[in-house]
């Protein structure tokens, strides 16, 4: 998920020379940027997170903060440094007048400044009637490993840690960073202050109603008695976790963030840093019945973002709102009428609903998976969560039409066995942000650092696109889709897989002169074809050209329209084998699909031919979907015939390694 998302405001304050010697200009002449929450009521003007460039040392951060104070004082402004960040992000939190922003943006080392904003607990209601605890028969949910090797950090309200359901399972840290409660007559009732956090701790690790009954937890208080916190408080909490991890390294860590605020560049950046330090972060998608990409930390790509479904696997409605959705959601989990510990009394239970509860379920599942396989990386864990999810059970009609294709139809489930999934070739589909409608607009989809991009496709609702291609960016392959003139924008769709010891490269064939079409194959010894992409510069790709058919017996090559350049993703990995599977329909149809068989994993999905009435191709779980324009607009010419091309792979090496372990 990228910074081009949604209504996020980026205010670049141009450097003006009205006041000479105001401050040194930033190095390299780059302009630091100012960001603030797009949701006005959530803004907290007067408090700012000043983020410094990545390699800035603590001493430089302190010096920059002092410099700001000194220069502000010379102009008659009082400032207060509330916190100096180090360990996760370099920077500082400052209380100052907004008049000083221009000054602050010119300080050395400053990368960007973000105005503080509110974050909120993502559960409702907080005070339903007490209900009796659930009854579990002995033969029901008794997991073999309850997550005992894993520590789950909970950033939430205060919690009643000696509730019977969680006593001894939760260590309350001394961390507290919360804003004052709103309203002059607010009455701080302890049981209400503890309500949200106690319930979630119970959902994660409760003795009788918990998912990971063996997991130990640590709680940090970042939400006040009204369930409200700040981005800055959450950042300081994440920094506290990172410092704790460095001081006393333990086993796998899961961080549960059952909160949401508006899109925040700095909160997403902090989550990214913590994830790259080996911590698994799980967050609520948000309860705003909106695109999760407009909220943080839900929009951070490194975080596992969880939407909420009910007992019927339908998206949860919460009053007039409901669960968030969209490409920034990784999966859904139970989030309606979830029974958990109630802070009303030490033996009470209560039902709460929301994406917080859904995230707590996934945090519990993650704890159990990590306890069974402590060496799992974040990418491996995410892929397993997706793999073991219930597929295609959510009624997508609940989501806005334009979000249906982007929203994963996955409901989290515990693996049938916490061991033995290692032989699988795991892949997932990653959608880019929308490119926007301009003629040269592009969209980029990226895989996680330890995933391989095995194929790249594109999709446009208008059909006006110029295909896609895989290209190197920062030493890693990315998937870039191109909009066409008059198009409403495109999506890039990356197929991201776990392929240990893989060596992948892209082979390109320029547009062919001959009428046979363009073709490219994997010529290196031991390399197999995992995906095909095509990209063209012409606005309309030969609408009346006859379709190109793949020559028989040549599975290791990509073919395409003669006016397009064709890109083949070729990979070498121990024991990797792939095959091409096609499904063509002679009559025009809005959707053509082809699926990989049991034991094979879909790595590539593309359409033949790549003509302009094809809206695009994308993978849904193990099925390749090719979408075309409404049949009524295409007529039934030969142009209407579309073939979905799937590339299905498996790894004999992974299968053998798994058998040897067993």
């Amino acid at each position: 998920q990228e910074d081009e998302d949604g209504d996020y405001e980026e205010l670049v304050l141009a450097l003006r020379s009205e006041e000479d010697g105001l401050a040194e200009a930033p190095e390299h002449g780059t302009t630091a940027t100012f960001h603030r929450c797009a949701k006005d009521p959530w803004r907290l003007p007067g408090t700012y997170v000043v983020v410094l460039k990545e390699e800035t040392h603590l001493s430089q951060s302190e010096r920059t903060a002092r410099r700001l104070q000194a220069q502000a004082a010379r102009r008659g402004y009082l400032t207060k440094i509330l916190h100096v960040f180090h360990g996760l992000l370099p920077g500082f939190l400052v209380k100052m007048s907004g008049d000083l922003l221009e000054l602050a943006l010119k300080l050395p080392h400053v990368d960007y400044i973000e105005e503080d904003s509110s974050v909120f607990a993502q559960s409702i209601p907080w005070n339903l009637e007490r209900i009796t605890p659930p009854r579990y028969r002995a033969d029901e949910y008794q997991p073999p490993d309850g997550g005992s090797l894993v520590e789950v950090y909970l950033l939430d309200t205060s919690i009643q840690s000696d509730h019977r359901e969680i006593e001894g399972r939760v260590m309350v840290t001394d961390f507290e960073n919360v804003p004052e409660e709103d309203g002059t007559r607010f009455h701080r009732q302890a049981s209400k202050c503890d309500s949200h956090g106690t319930h979630l701790a119970g959902v994660v690790s409760g003795r009788d109603a918990g998912v990971a009954k063996g997991a130990s937890m640590r709680s940090l208080r970042v939400l006040n008695c009204q369930g409200k916190g700040t981005v800055s408080g959450t950042l300081i909490g994440l920094e506290f976790i990172r410092k704790s991890q460095l001081v006393q390294p333990v086993g796998p860590l899961v961080v549960l963030l059952p909160l949401a605020g508006g899109y925040s560049r700095v909160l997403n950046a902090a989550c990214q840093r913590l994830a790259r330090a080996g911590v698994v972060l799980v967050t609520a998608a948000g309860n705003f019945r909106d695109d999760a990409c407009l909220y943080s930390p839900a929009s951070a790509p490194e975080v596992i973002t969880v939407g909420a479904t009910n007992a019927q696997d339908q998206p949860v409605t919460l009053g007039t709102l409901g669960t968030n959705f969209g490409r920034c959601v990784d999966l859904f989990a139970p989030g309606e009428d979830i029974i958990g510990a109630s802070s009303d009394c030490s033996t009470c239970f209560v039902s709460q609903s929301g994406t917080s509860q859904a995230a707590a379920h996934v945090a519990g599942i993650a704890a159990m998976m990590l306890s069974a396989e402590p060496e799992l990386t974040l990418a491996e864990l995410r892929q397993r969560l997706i793999h073991f999810s219930a597929k295609d059970v959510i009624n997508e009609a609940w989501f806005p039409e334009d979000q249906r294709v982007l929203t994963p139809n996955l409901v989290a489930a515990l693996p049938p066995s916490t061991h033995g999934a290692g032989w699988q070739l795991f892949c997932r589909t990653v959608w880019s942000a929308h490119s926007g409608p301009t003629r040269m607009a592009t969209a980029v989809a990226r895989c996680a650092p330890d995933e391989e991009l095995l194929s790249c496709s594109s999709f446009s609702r208008s059909g006006k696109r110029r295909g896609e291609r895989m290209e190197a960016q920062g030493g890693k392959l990315v998937c870039r889709a191109h909009n066409a003139f008059g198009g409403e924008g495109v999506y890039a769709i990356a197929r991201c897989c776990l392929l240990p010891q893989a060596n992948c490269s892209v082979h390109t064939a320029p547009p062919a002169e001959a009428s046979m079409g363009t073709r490219v194959h994997c010529h290196q010894q031991g390399h197999v074809l995992t995906g095909c992409s095509s990209h063209w510069e012409v606005e309309d790709l030969g609408t009346h050209k006859p379709p190109v058919l793949r020559p028989r017996g040549q599975p290791n090559q990509c073919v395409g329209h003669r006016e397009a350049s064709i890109h083949a993703s070729c990979c070498h990995a121990p024991g990797l084998e792939c095959k091409v599977k096609e499904h063509g329909i002679p009559a025009p149809q809005e959707q053509v699909t082809v699926a990989c068989e049991e034991g094979w994993t879909l790595t590539g999905c593309s359409a033949l031919p790549g003509t302009s009435h094809v809206l695009g191709a994308y993978a849904v779980d193990n099925t390749c979907v090719v979408r075309s324009r409404d049949v009524s607009t295409t007529g039934s010419t030969s142009e209407g015939a579309v073939t979905a091309v799937a590339i299905c792979c498996r790894s004999r090496h992974l299968a053998q390694a798994s058998q040897e372990l067993q």
Partner: antibody, heavy 115, light 109 residues
């Protein structure tokens, strides 16, 4: 190490009150409450109630409700159990134990109610 | 609160295995994962041997094991030793409180 240390034996007359203390050490106090359990001579164990070291909330067994008061002094990490209107059948060894899970027990305090 | 039902006594020879049962209702044993077993030697406080049906605290011999089926929990002691001779009590959560069994005297013959 985790320890619960109780006050010494008491002899009381019927109708009087007794207050037994239990000092906790070696663990994060607020992560567990304290349960009180008694055992009459030659008899089984009887759960009397629980107090939160976190917020002082209590949960008393029906049988002793109205006669028992449990309190906590966080400054000294000490929990108290007071039983009023003592009767001869209140003669027992009184134990404090950590939490509802009762994984650690005090050494016991013998309370004898005799006229 | 009526006590959970335990046999008054069981006995076994050294090296043998014995099982003590603890029967309740679906409002206590059957409804919760929180059944515990305690060992008590004369004049000593009870000692936790099994918690949450089948988990052993650290330091407790793996000769002690717990299980549950429906409304009945069981404690099994294998390879009986002389020092195992003691009273054994089970306990369970109820909706608002705790309940104990009446206790079982284990005699090692």
């Amino acid at each position: 190490q985790v320890q619960l240390v109780q006050s010494g034996a008491e002899v009381k007359k019927p109708g009087a009150s007794v207050k037994v203390s239990c000092k906790a050490s070696g663990y994060a106090l607020t992560s567990y409450g304290i349960s009180w359990v008694r055992q009459a001579p030659g008899q089984g164990l009887e759960w009397m109630g629980w107090i939160s070291a976190y917020n002082g909330n209590t949960n008393y067994a029906q049988k002793v409700q109205g006669r028992v008061t449990m309190t906590t002094d966080t400054s000294t990490s000490t929990v108290y159990m007071e039983l009023r209107s003592l009767r001869s059948d209140d003669t027992a060894v009184y134990y404090c134990a950590r939490g509802y899970g009762m994984d650690v027990w005090g050494q016991g305090t013998t309370v004898t109610v005799s006229s | 609160q009526s006590a959970l039902t335990q046999p008054a006594s069981v006995s076994g020879s050294p090296g043998q295995s014995i099982t003590i049962s603890c029967t309740g209702t679906n409002s206590d044993v059957g409804g919760y994962n929180s059944v515990s077993w305690y060992q008590q030697h004369p004049g000593k406080p009870p000692k936790l041997m099994i918690y949450e049906v089948s988990n052993r605290p650290s330091g407790i011999s793996n000769r002690f094991s717990g299980s549950k089926s429906g409304n009945t929990a069981s404690l099994t002691i294998s390879g009986l030793q002389a020092e195992d001779e003691a009273d054994y009590f089970c306990s369970s959560y109820t909706s608002t409180s705790m309940v104990f069994g009446g206790g079982t005297k284990l005699t090692v013959l």
